[in-house]
């Protein structure tokens, strides 16, 4: 259901967490949202600028029977073969009723650095 | 709730520098880009710039590279705009505003007139 | 860089007449990403701050009266009052953010 412009209640239950590790580490970062009625498309961010090829897997789970019921939403960011070009902060983001939602940040970085 | 707030006014002299403050409350600073807008008396609206403040990475409208600097602080979660060797041309109302991805809600501070004069 | 043109650059009207504005882009908007036209509405009322009416080319900002349309694709783009009040009076500007941000030279709407 569209949410008005001031009530920013963000509909992100669990947000990407943290991965450091070697070059060449495989890893993945997951984002968590329920909301009411259709699942939107979750965009995955790095430092702010939307992932054009990002390598994400998304699945949706009825809380109910009925189509505008609750449903769980779950992206998963998976980070192959890890780079400095990969390090920075990432969000999930959605585009929901009249608002955009961000999720909290996590953060990738390289050991050693 | 979402809140840019801008000075009201600045009065410099010309050939100064001058820093224009927005501080931001009412979200998570460090995820969405702020942008810089300019507006002189009966003119249109331009683009200046943006700061992503969680990395401070920057985006310039090449007309103001030599004359604008975008900086943040994260700790009073603040923006900054500075201007070097200002001019009559740089008299004009500065606005910032929160980028929104392309979407909504969007959130304008009230702008600040900044006057260069003598 | 992106330019976009706006016209006309004033036009006065009564109120209850229909008024269309354009936009013109010099590239296409849309994201084949996020499947979003990236062209927003504004309106700017004298000594206020601009004020969002419609973004992604045709979506209504929550709380603008349903007088404003948006249309548009590809390059091209329209606004639309359908009954124009007294309270419309403002200057309306596009903008994109498809690259950054660029704004349209803007729209007066005068009130005869």
């Known amino acids: 259901a569209p949410r008005g412009t001031q009530a920013e209640e963000s509909p992100f239950v669990g947000n990407p967490g943290n991965i450091t590790g070697a070059r060449g580490l495989t890893g993945t970062l997951r984002c968590q949202l329920q909301v009411q009625g259709e699942p939107p498309e979750v965009h995955w961010l790095r430092d702010g600028q939307i992932l054009e090829l990002a390598d994400s897997t998304q699945t949706q789970v009825p809380l109910g029977e009925d189509e505008q019921d609750d449903w769980i939403v779950v992206s998963q960011l998976r980070i192959t073969s890890l780079q400095l070009s990969d390090t920075g902060q990432y969000q999930c983001l959605v585009f929901l009723g009249h608002q955009t939602f961000v999720s909290q940040p996590g953060y990738v970085g390289l050991e050693g650095l | 709730q979402v809140q840019l707030q801008q000075p009201g006014a600045e009065l410099v002299k010309p050939g100064a520098s001058v820093k224009l403050s927005c501080k931001a409350s009412?979200?998570?600073?460090?995820?969405?880009?702020i942008n810089w807008v300019k507006q002189r008396p009966g003119q249109g609206l331009e683009w200046i710039g943006n700061?992503?403040?969680?990395?401070?990475?920057?985006n310039y409208n090449e007309k103001f590279k030599s004359k604008a600097t975008l900086t943040v602080d994260k700790s009073s979660t603040t923006a900054y705009i500075q201007f070097s060797s200002l001019t009559s041309e740089d008299s004009a109302v500065y606005y910032c505003t929160r980028d929104t991805y392309g979407g909504s809600p969007d959130y304008w501070g009230q702008g600040t007139t900044l006057t260069v004069s003598s | 860089d992106i330019v976009m043109s706006q016209s006309p650059s004033s036009l006065a009207v009564s109120a209850g007449e229909k008024v269309t504005m354009s936009c013109k882009s010099s590239q296409s908007l849309l994201n084949s990403r996020t499947r979003k036209i990236y062209l927003a509405w504004y309106q700017q009322k004298p000594g206020q701050s601009p004020k969002l009416l419609i973004y992604?080319?045709?979506t209504r900002q929550s709380g603008v009266p349903d007088r404003f349309t948006g249309s548009g694709s590809g390059t091209d783009f329209t606004l639309t009052i359908s009954s124009v009040q007294a309270e419309d009076l403002a200057v309306y500007y596009c903008k994109q953010s498809y690259n950054l941000w660029t704004f349209g030279g803007g729209t007066k709407l005068e009130i005869k």
């Open positions: 700061i992503y403040p969680d990395s401070s990475s920057t």
């Open positions: 992604w080319a045709s």
């Open positions: 009412g979200y998570t600073f460090t995820s969405y880009w």
